[in-house]
């Protein structure tokens, strides 16, 4: 019989990661921290009304990659970033705007601004 | 094989501090959490917080805030739990337990912490 | 915080019984990144640790006798013993592991008739 706090080894687990979360936590959060197997990340994206929206959190592992690779959307301004280094990595990501395309404005819905 | 080494017993006066430990071998320490639990006599179980050995980020229970401060030294695998202003409530057996994705897979034997003058 | 209630607070069995108790959190386990339900059990033998039996809901521990047995989704989770041993006296809890606080149900106690 093992001691009682002895055991055999731990197969090796993905090992849970903490990120900041900001308007996307989930429910019951505490400290605006979410937990896991994934990604951390920070995405501005532009509203409805062209102003600039930060949102940060947790994406799990399985599709994170797609989600975090930054591809383009015909006329939605938004970018990402992610990061896996350290517990509340995403804190230091600034993710900013892509530029305006003069073709933003022709084929998109026309902004006053 | 996993090893959570812990004191069996703490005597300690009222108003005092207590600094309990656990010691870690049979796996990378950095590669698991570490956490501690909170059992009072007959009673149930209680997330105090938890601690990543690896950049030494830690998470409180609200509960636990300014009662208990977690630490590693990872040079000797061993985890930290200082509990300070001591009363009759913190008398209790204190359980260190490593996670990878915050469920206990390996838990200490405990030390029983008796606050008493 | 989630809230975790077990049911019923004690029971007892005899040998060979089929044992069922109860689980339920105040908020679903659920993540829909992964179809995983994050809720673990653990057996507390008297003057013992408590020991890992089942997470993730359903996934059985390396060790763990099969007559264990986790089920449940959403909020309401069960441990089932299939066949009860004398040795399976002990006090079984719950815990959520989906986000921090990290929370446990108060227990259920087993005893043997």
């Known amino acids: 019989k093992k001691e009682d706090g002895e055991s055999t080894a731990p197969t090796p687990r993905p090992k849970v990661l903490r990120c900041k979360c900001h308007h996307h936590c989930p429910e019951d959060s505490v400290n605006n921290i979410c937990s896991t197997d994934g990604y951390c990340f920070t995405m501005i994206e532009e509203d409805d009304s062209g102003l600039p929206v930060v949102t940060s959190g947790c994406l799990g592992l399985e599709g994170s990659d797609f989600q975090c690779r930054d591809t383009p959307i015909p006329h939605q301004r938004r970018s990402i970033e992610c990061c896996t280094e350290r517990n509340e990595c995403n804190k230091d990501l600034h993710p900013t705007l892509p530029p305006l395309k003069n073709r933003d404005f022709v084929d998109g819905p026309i902004h006053h601004r | 094989q996993v090893q959570l080494q812990q004191p069996g017993a703490e005597l300690v006066k009222p108003g005092a501090s207590v600094k309990l430990s656990c010691k870690a071998s049979g796996y990378t320490f950095t590669s698991y959490w570490m956490h501690w639990v909170k059992q009072r006599p007959g009673q149930g179980l209680e997330w105090i917080g938890d601690?990543?050995?690896?950049?030494?980020?830690?998470n409180y229970n609200q509960k636990f805030k300014g009662k208990a401060t977690l630490t590693v030294d990872t040079t000797s695998s061993t985890a930290y739990m200082q509990l300070s202003s001591l009363t009759s409530e913190d008398s209790a057996v204190y359980y260190c337990a490593i996670s990878g994705w915050d469920y206990f897979d390996y838990w200490g034997q405990g030390t029983t912490l008796t606050v008493s003058s | 915080d989630i809230v975790m209630t077990q049911s019923p607070s004690s029971l007892a069995m005899s040998v060979g019984q089929k044992v069922t108790m109860s689980c339920k959190s105040s908020q679903s386990l659920l993540k829909s990144s992964n179809q995983k339900n994050y809720l673990a059990w653990y057996q507390q033998k008297p003057g013992q640790s408590p020991k890992l039996l089942v997470y993730?809901?359903?996934t059985r521990e390396s060790g763990v006798p099969d007559r264990f047995i986790g089920s449940g989704s959403g909020t309401d989770f069960t441990l089932t013993i299939s066949s009860v041993q004398a040795e399976d006296l002990a006090d079984y809890f719950c815990?959520?592991?989906?986000?921090?606080?990290?929370?446990f149900g108060a227990g259920t106690k087993l005893e043997l008739k």
């Open positions: 993730f809901a359903s």
């Open positions: 815990q959520q592991h989906y986000n921090i606080p990290l929370t």
């Open positions: 601690i990543d050995p690896s950049d030494r980020y830690t």
